[in-house]
């Protein structure tokens, strides 16, 4: 067990803070909840503290909860591949570019680390080149979320990992909005971290609303489990 893994043996409180700017529409989101890595379970509630969110909530799920992949359940035979926990408590920087097919892109930078007993994910998001009447700024996404696989590979040069996955957002007209994610994680501290063999995280997310909440918000329940060493993933990164 890595030193960082010992911090995740029970339920851990989570705080998420995001400052965003998409096509000049500025907003802030605050989230609170808890994670239980034993089950790979996350329960979080997010509130837009600046009024109405200018983008659909589902487009931010990966930035919020896929940001705290340290709560993923790694089975016993895969614990030596868990970079995320091994970087704790000092944490990691997580940077992403998210390309929305036929639309704009998000760039995000987050620091994920322990502050006291709380796991904190502080994020800055910048979105550009979005169509004002497109699926994102036009709020045409359904309020739901599909299951996905998140592909992880070691980045030995940067003592971290590279990650790729493609999200399928359901559109109200029955079509799909694709969002291709490119992610890089690097440790904040200088202690040893686990550099994994290639594998993936299997994610399942459910979005809901709090009937007593008047503000624009999202309630998220998520389960994430690490799974098989996938074939072929090393070819590009030899």
């Amino acid at each position: 067990m890595s030193k960082g893994e010992e911090l995740f043996t029970g339920v851990v409180p989570i705080l998420v803070e995001l400052d965003g700017d998409v096509n000049g529409h500025k907003f802030s989101v605050s989230g609170e909840g808890e994670g239980d890595a034993t089950y790979g379970k996350l329960t979080l509630k997010f509130i837009c503290t600046t009024g109405k969110l200018p983008v659909p909530w589902p487009t931010l799920v990966t930035t919020f909860s896929y940001g705290v992949q340290c709560f993923s359940r790694y089975p016993d035979h895969m614990k030596q591949h868990d970079f995320f926990k091994s970087a704790m408590p000092e944490g990691y920087v997580q940077e992403r570019t998210i390309f929305f097919k036929d639309d704009g892109n998000y760039k995000t930078r987050a620091e994920v680390k322990f502050e006291g007993d709380t796991l904190v994910n502080r994020i800055e998001l910048k979105g550009i080149d979005f169509k004002e009447d497109g699926n994102i700024l036009g709020h045409k996404l359904e309020y739901n979320y599909n299951s996905h696989n998140v592909y992880i590979m070691a980045d030995k040069q940067k003592n971290g990992i590279k990650v790729n996955f493609k999200i399928r957002h359901n559109i109200e007209d029955g079509s799909v909005q694709l969002a291709d994610h490119y992610q890089q994680n690097t440790p904040i501290g200088d202690g040893p971290v686990l550099l994994p063999d290639n594998h993936y995280l299997s994610t399942q997310s459910a979005l809901s609303k709090d009937p007593n909440e008047k503000r624009d918000h999202m309630v998220l329940l998520e389960f994430v489990t690490a799974a098989g060493i996938t074939h072929g993933m090393d070819e590009l990164y030899k």
Epitope: N149, Y151, G232, L236
Partner: nanobody, 130 residues
């Protein structure tokens, strides 16, 4: 609209060769990884090979390495699968599929499974007799 049309399948004896073609239309070729998959009766669809036409990155399943070669002709928006030294266990319907990505080469390097692909052709039958 998006179309992928496979051709080149047929009946061949073990040790023989076939060249499959996948002609694509309706999308920007360079924005996609193109993959070949196959499905034998009663079995799951499995990945065979894939290519990023933008930079030539390729992926091969272990079972076909050294025997199959994938290539693309960007001017014709076409991907080819040259299959040599065919074996009876290569018998299957072969499908061509397209996977949109901002950087297709990374998707190819990942060797993503069938359900990650966005568009599919109708398939072409390959039968290898012993």
């Amino acid at each position: 609209q998006v179309q992928l049309v496979e051709s080149g399948g047929g009946l061949v004896q073990a040790g023989g060769s076939l060249r499959l073609s996948c002609v694509t239309s309706g999308f920007t070729f360079d924005d996609y990884a193109i993959g070949w998959f196959r499905q034998a009766p009663g079995k799951e669809r499995e990945g065979v090979s894939s290519i990023s036409s933008s930079d030539g990155t390729t992926y091969y399943a272990d079972s076909v390495k050294g025997r199959f070669t994938i290539s693309s002709d960007n001017a014709k928006n076409t991907v080819y699968l040259q299959m040599n030294n065919l074996k009876p266990e290569d018998t299957a319907v072969y499908y061509c599929a397209a996977d949109w990505a901002a950087w297709p080469s990374i998707r190819v390097g990942v060797g993503v499974p069938a359900y990650e692909y966005d568009y599919w052709g109708q398939g072409t039958q390959v039968t290898v007799s012993s």
